[in-house]
């Protein structure tokens, strides 16, 4: 018979014949022959392979380095990698969460609605009329404009979402 040029799903072509791929969690030890099946072996304790494969080496589980603020969110198995997340108060620098930074900041004009946790970023909100935040901060909320009236002063300069009002003395009417 003609040697195959393509193989079925979960097979691979080698030496003009179709061999079964190794299932997730196992690595290839030897290719199939005319007389033997593909030989596969389970991955070791701290290793994984997450696809049907013909890899001769399993991948190492990711290490969640506590010195980078990382901790294990989900322990790896023979078929899945370890998932890292950040300790409370840190946030992942990337989707892969390879390192952590302290809480991300809200820009001036925005206040912190909720500080970051290991799994969620800082939630910022725009400062509404009557409130301001003049710094880039992961902790500062929107604060109300100063009330000039309660200090017996008048508004000399209107506030914005980034600046407080400026109060000044009332003009005294001359007799």
């Amino acid at each position: 018979p003609e040697p195959p040029t393509a193989c079925r799903e979960k097979q691979y072509l080698i030496n003009s014949q179709c061999c079964s791929l190794c299932q997730p969690g196992q690595k290839l030890v030897s290719d199939c022959t005319e007389f033997t099946e593909t030989e596969c072996l389970p991955c070791g304790e701290s290793e994984f392979l997450d696809t049907w494969n013909r890899e001769t080496h399993c991948h190492q589980h990711k290490y969640c380095d506590p010195n980078l603020g990382l901790r294990v969110q989900q322990k790896g198995t023979s078929e899945t990698d370890t998932i890292c997340t950040c300790e409370e108060g840190w946030h992942c620098t990337s989707e892969a969460c390879e390192s952590c930074v302290l809480h991300r900041s809200c820009s001036p004009g925005f206040g912190v609605k909720q500080i970051a946790t290991g799994v969620s970023d800082t939630i910022c909100e725009p400062c509404p009329v009557g409130f301001f935040s003049n710094v880039s901060s992961a902790f500062e909320k929107c604060h109300p404009w100063t009330s000039c009236e309660t200090k017996d002063l008048v508004v000399q300069q209107a506030g914005t979402n980034k600046t407080d009002v400026v109060c000044g003395p009332q003009d005294r009417l001359r007799a």
Epitope: N67, L68, G69, S99, V101, L102, H103, R104, S105, V112, V135, S136, S137, A138, F139, E140, K141, H143
Partner: nanobody, 116 residues
Framework: EVQLLESGGGLVQPGGSLRLSCAAS????????MSWVRQAPGKGLEWVSG????????YYADSVKGRFTISRDNSKNTLYLQMNSLRAEDTAVYYC?????????WGQGTLVTVSS
């Protein structure tokens, strides 16, 4: 060059108090968030508390809420952590950290040991 120098640690009995200080230099202190972070022996880093640049807003990890108080004096470029009702599990090296601080600019820390 950014420098953060922590001090005030020591040995204290359970229920006791300590006040940590962090002297900052080499950056505009009054425009930065600041945090206290700790590392217990053999454990990972734990964020303890944070304060906004002008000191208006403060946050605490649940483990220290009601016992620790963070504050700052921008005229002295200094960050503080008042620690009351100390417990054995508060034993750690305490670091102050600048802004989002990617671990680059940390001081040597100050060791707090809570033991009878």
């Amino acid at each position: 060059e950014v420098q953060l120098l922590e001090s005030g640690g020591g040995l204290v009995q359970p229920g006791g108090s300590l006040r940590l200080s962090c002297a900052a230099s080499g950056f505009t202190f009054e425009s930065q968030d600041m945090s206290w972070v700790r590392q217990a022996p053999g454990k990972g880093l734990e964020w303890v508390s944070g304060i906004s640049p002008n000191g208006w807003d403060t946050y605490y990890a649940d483990s220290v809420k009601g016992r620790f108080t963070i504050s700052r004096d921008n005229s002295k470029n200094t960050l503080y952590l008042q620690m009351n009702s100390l417990r054995a599990e508060d034993t750690a090296v305490y670091y102050c950290a600048k802004d989002r601080s990617d671990f680059d600019y940390w001081g040597q820390g100050t060791l707090v040991t809570v033991s009878s």
